[in-house]
């Protein structure tokens, strides 16, 4: 004959544990039913009656099988620099993540507690490391032969155009200006190419000179929510 299935509440056999979705109630000394996600325990079990569960009320939740007396409160509404990627429901907490152009400066178990705007590299500086969901942009000065004339959290240092005849030589924040003869592009030393589109101009190709072996003077600025460092702007 098959063994009798015990219905909650029941006293467990000595040395055995309660079954899945049950808990041992110390007061009743019985195995009792847990409440499902979206519920909480309204009345705890006794020797003769099982747990009475109730719905999680507005803006509260439980994500797991439980016997908590009250559901957990959902986090506060997402701030203006965030987007709600998961709504508050009776079975899950609200999750806020940073909107585009921002990164998470202070994370929490799920989602983000504090978002900060991505650092913008000012003219003469380009993006050395792009921002991610959880890290800020790292700027670096444009190496000789490269420039950036924008204030941007995405633009890298681009190579100066190579002129047959230079009208105005380029610097870290300005491209070279050529006389009327057609310019060509060079991969100058220290030019960084990040995996993102870079605006190109129509140009004649010409063999590029061998890169110089001179050491690069570029450096990385610290990551994280630090005050605007050299080469970056908080705007």
């Amino acid at each position: 004959l098959p063994a009798q299935v015990a219905f909650t509440p029941y006293a467990p056999e000595p040395g055995s544990t309660c079954r899945l979705r049950e808990y041992y109630d110390q007061t009743a000394q019985m195995c009792c039913s847990k409440c499902s996600p979206g519920q909480h325990a309204k009345v705890f079990c006794t020797k003769t009656s099982d747990t009475v569960c109730d719905s999680c009320e507005d803006s509260t939740y439980t994500q797991l099988w439980n016997w908590v007396p009250e559901c957990l409160s959902c986090g506060s509404r997402c701030s203006s620099d965030q987007v709600e990627t998961q709504a508050c429901t009776r079975e899950q907490n609200r999750i806020c993540t940073c909107r585009p152009g921002w990164y998470c400066a202070l994370s929490k178990q799920e989602g983000c507690r504090l978002c900060a705007p991505l650092r913008k590299c000012r003219p003469g500086f380009g993006v050395a490391r792009p921002g991610t969901e959880t890290s800020d942009v790292v700027c670096k000065p444009c190496a000789p032969g490269t420039f950036s004339n924008t204030t941007s959290s995405t633009d890298i240092c681009r190579p100066h155009q190579i002129c047959n005849v230079v009208a105005i030589p380029g610097n870290a924040s300005m491209d070279a200006v050529c006389t009327s003869t057609s310019p060509t592009r060079s991969m100058a030393p220290g030019a960084v190419h990040l995996p993102q589109p870079v605006s190109t101009r129509s140009q004649h190709t010409q063999p590029t000179p061998e890169p110089s072996t001179a050491p690069s003077t570029s450096f990385l600025l610290p990551m994280g929510p630090s005050p605007p460092a050299e080469g970056s702007t908080g705007d």
Epitope: C35, S36, D54
Partner: antibody, heavy 118, light 106 residues
Framework: QVQLKESGAALVKPGASVKMSCKAS????????VSWVRQSHGRSLEWIGE????????NFNEKFRGRATLTVDKSTSTASMELSRLTSEDSAIYYC???????????WGPGTMVTVSS | NIVMTQSPTTTAASPGEKVTITCLAS?????IYWYQQKSGASPKPLIY???SLASGVPDRFSGSGSGTSYSLTINTMEAEDAATYYC?????????FGSGTKLEIK
């Protein structure tokens, strides 16, 4: 599209029980709790209870605990409610509704008319 | 149980007129939900979480309020808005509904 189809009207005697069903379609049945709400003639709405097809757990309005039995059949995406010890006060339209993942009822069935009369 | 008191019980409005229905809770609630029920039909959600419009609801409907006092506003009444409106809370179990406001067209 989400649809909730309820069983037909019932005429029952006082003291008896009535069982009604609600077949869901157009969404994943186990993703939402199913609630039962009644509306007595010309009166407001009254929540009876709800069941989770996913967890097979129930919540009740204390007024109906012990008198209402909620069940689900996942294989046919059908929720059922049995109400026992009926009195004339139980004459009403009984609606099944899908409880939104939050705290309101976003889709409703057409209702089942229950008349309790000797 | 939280008691939801709606006012007015019945009202009538001309097309184009602004209509406001209020709902008072017997104790503070976090949110309110509004439903529209036309004669012989099932209730249909209008507003959820106090002020968010349910799917397919025209933007002439809006909701506001906090604590114990909430309201539903129809900015410009249309003939199809003639119905009974109910508020509902679920800040305390069990969820409870208001007694309804019947809105007629003049």
């Amino acid at each position: 599209q989400v649809q909730l189809k309820e069983s037909g009207a019932a005429l029952v005697k006082p003291g008896a029980s009535v069982k009604m069903s609600c077949k869901a379609s157009g969404y994943t049945f186990t993703d939402h709790w199913v609630s039962w709400v009644r509306q007595s003639h010309g009166r407001s709405l009254e929540w009876i209870g709800e069941i989770s097809p996913n967890y097979d757990t129930t919540n009740f309005n204390e007024k109906f605990r012990g008198r209402a039995t909620l069940t689900v059949d996942k294989s046919t995406s059908t929720a059922s409610m049995e109400l026992s010890r009926l009195t004339s006060e139980d004459s009403a339209i009984y609606y099944c509704s899908r409880t939104n993942s939050g705290w309101y009822f976003d889709f409703w069935g057409p209702g089942t008319m229950v008349t309790v009369s000797s | 149980n939280i008691v939801m008191t709606q006012s007015p019980t019945t009202t009538a409005a001309s097309p184009g007129e602004k209509v406001t229905i209020t709902c008072l809770a017997s104790s503070s609630v976090r949110n309110i939900y509004w439903y529209q029920q036309k004669s012989g039909a099932s209730p249909k959600p209008l507003i959820y979480s106090t002020s968010s419009l349910a799917s397919g609801v025209p933007d002439r409907f809006s909701g506001s309020g906090s604590g114990t006092s909430y309201s539903l506003t129809i900015n410009t009444m249309e003939a199809e808005d003639a119905a009974t409106y109910y508020c509902q809370q679920w800040s305390r179990n069990p969820p409870t509904f208001g007694s309804g406001t019947k809105l007629e067209i003049k």
